[in-house]
Interface confidence: medium
């Protein structure tokens, strides 16, 4: 979690003098409670916007917007604390709006915005706006919170952001997998425009099981410039194990921008259809039924969200 360093955030507006300050997320009013405190924010909205840095990078940012309730408590409103918590790491970042003048009227609804929190693809955040001073112990809460889920790099608008491009989001390998005779798989994919090596990771599973029955890793050396954007064809030999028939092929690139941490793409080949034979009646009743019916072939990312389907 970090803040954009450019342009400098602004919270001043007509009728209000205000400055944005870094915050420790522990406002003084927690330690020294005040008697009279303002009401909570109204209509908190968080949206995904994008910001260009001075260096020309494009980053996803959380655009935070809220309004004030039209009550007399604005007379005691001294500012606001904005907090963003990344849920998977518990990392928190805060800023404070410090009002340098008093709000004295509601001629128009007061609206505040802040768009300087840089967020990461495929992460969930809790965004909280606290009005200051914070309430006395056991006082009514004067904050509003909302969760905010950032799309992953597969999303059209996220794909061109710097963090996504750095992890290889623009590379579409268009993987095809073909089952050959004599226990072989032919894997074909499109190389990216970088002289870097790739790894093909093959994991095979029995029908309807998630414990692997065969694993194999194949190294593909860095292509020459004339091979960029060309198809690479690799034939993998499978172990002759009856029933070890569902194969997941994962391609891991090692681009200079992401090294060992690049987005992987995978394709799955399902087991061939079984002929209809009467099943023996089990002498026990299973507690649950495994779900069946996967597609013949799918090309998807390493999180398993299907982003291409090809049937053959």
């Amino acid at each position: 979690l970090r803040l954009l360093d450019f342009p400098a955030p602004v919270c001043a507006q007509e009728g209000l003098s205000c400055r944005v300050k870094n915050s420790t997320c522990l406002d003084d009013s927690w330690i020294h409670p005040r008697n009279l405190t303002p009401s909570s924010p109204k209509d908190l909205q968080i949206q995904l916007h994008f910001a260009h840095t001075q260096q020309g990078d494009l980053f996803p940012v959380a655009h935070i917007e809220w309004t004030l309730q039209t009550d007399a408590s604005i007379l005691y409103l001294e500012g606001a604390e904005l907090s963003v918590l990344q849920l998977n790491t518990n990392e928190r970042l805060c800023v404070r709006f410090e009002f340098l003048s008093k709000l004295r009227h509601h001629h128009r609804r007061w609206r505040f915005t802040f768009s300087h929190f840089v967020v990461d693809p495929d992460q969930e955040y809790e965004v909280t706006v606290h009005h200051l001073p914070k309430p006395i112990p056991d006082g009514d809460p004067n904050h509003q919170s909302k969760n905010f889920l950032v799309p992953d790099c597969e999303h059209a608008r996220m794909k061109v952001t710097t963090p996504c491009m750095s992890s290889g989001s623009l590379w579409d390998p268009n993987i095809t997998v073909e089952t050959l005779e004599a226990h072989q798989l032919r894997v074909s994919f499109t190389l990216w425009n970088e002289s870097t090596h790739y790894q093909i990771l093959l994991t095979s599973f029995p029908h309807m099981e998630n414990h692997s029955c065969f694993e194999h890793m194949h190294h593909i050396p860095a292509p020459r410039p004339e091979e960029f954007h060309q198809r690479s064809n690799v034939t993998l030999t499978l172990r002759n194990l009856k029933g070890c028939c569902r194969h997941q092929v994962q391609i891991q690139p090692f681009f200079s921008s992401c090294l060992n941490d690049c987005l992987r793409h995978s394709a799955t080949v399902s087991c061939p259809e079984m002929p209809d034979t009467p099943e023996p009646i089990p002498d026990y009743m299973p507690l649950w039924e495994p779900r069946s019916g996967s597609s013949d072939y799918k090309d998807d990312d390493d999180k398993g969200s299907s982003h291409h389907h090809h049937h053959h």
């Epitope: 968080i46 949206q47 995904l48 909302k146 889920l149 999303h155 059209a156 982003h307 291409h308 389907h309």
Partner: antibody, heavy 131, light 107 residues
Framework: QVQLQESGPGLVKPSETLSLTCTVS????????WNWIRQSPGKGLEWIGD???????NYNPSLKSRVTISVDTSKNQFSLKLSSVTTADTAVYYC?????????????????????????WGQGTTVTVSS | DILMTQSPSSLSASVGDRVTITCRAS??????LGWYQQKPGKAPKRLIY???SLQSGVPSRFSGSGSGTEFTLTISSLQPEDFATYYC?????????FGPGTKVDIK
């Protein structure tokens, strides 16, 4: 209320460059993507490309070699240039704004959706390619 | 490119009928889909966003459903002003693509 207005010549000669401008009124061009879409006579809709207010562009690969989209934030305008036109480029050309995200809430708990899509359109301008 | 298909390509219906139009994507697009109505000589107008959310100002007789690859637009009780062509649009991955359209005319 944001409104979009396309402008430019209605007749372009084959092999020349088609140039159109979209003027945004009633709102800022900032923080949105701005799209060009076209519709050939009696045909469906085809997305040409888009531009972010900062100048970052995305183009339809089928037209990429001939398309340039640019933005002028000071005038609240964005423009389309399509080079080497043929009669197949005769169409109604629309500009459209890519909508902001919409958040809405399900029963008991929230559900947040990332939404982009064209929510505000210009009325369209007809461009005929003919000698 | 993601190919969007619509069915039927045209249909004839009467005022008061329930009308259902289906849109299919050639690969999963989550809920990144909108439905648009277009009348002759006019720009498309958005009816539904995020696959199932009703655009502000659009009558509640329009509804959308679906996720992934299959989506549906339903008009619960067709009105005279609903005779038009309807398009779906995926905005999940570039290039954004429209369905070929479904023309709804008077029976």
């Amino acid at each position: 209320q944001v409104q979009l207005q396309e402008s430019g010549p209605g007749l372009v000669k084959p092999s020349e460059t088609l140039s159109l401008t979209c003027t945004v009124s009633g709102g800022s061009i900032s923080n949105y993507y701005w799209n060009w879409i076209r519709q050939s006579p009696g045909k469906g809709l085809e997305w040409i490309g888009d531009i972010y207010y900062s100048g970052s562009t995305n183009y339809n690969p089928s037209l990429k070699s001939r398309v340039t989209i640019s933005v002028d934030t000071s005038k609240n305008q964005f423009s389309l240039k399509l080079s080497s036109v043929t009669t197949a480029d005769t169409a109604v050309y629309y500009c459209a704004r890519d909508g902001e995200l919409a958040n809405y809430y399900g029963s008991g708990s929230y559900q947040f959706y990332y939404y982009y899509g064209m929510d505000v359109w210009g009325q369209g301008t007809t461009v005929t390619v003919s000698s | 490119d993601i190919l969007m298909t619509q069915s039927p390509s045209s249909l004839s219906a009467s005022v008061g009928d329930r009308v259902t139009i289906t849109c299919r994507a050639s690969q999963g697009i989550r809920n990144d889909l909108g439905w648009y109505q277009q009348k002759p000589g006019k720009a498309p107008k958005r009816l539904i966003y995020a696959a199932s959310s009703l655009q502000s100002g659009v009558p509640s007789r329009f509804s959308g459903s679906g996720s992934g690859t299959e989506f549906t637009l339903t008009i619960s009780s067709l009105q005279p002003e609903d005779f038009a062509t309807y398009y779906c649009l995926q905005h999940n991955s570039n290039p954004f693509t429209f369905g070929p359209g479904t023309k709804v005319d008077i029976k």
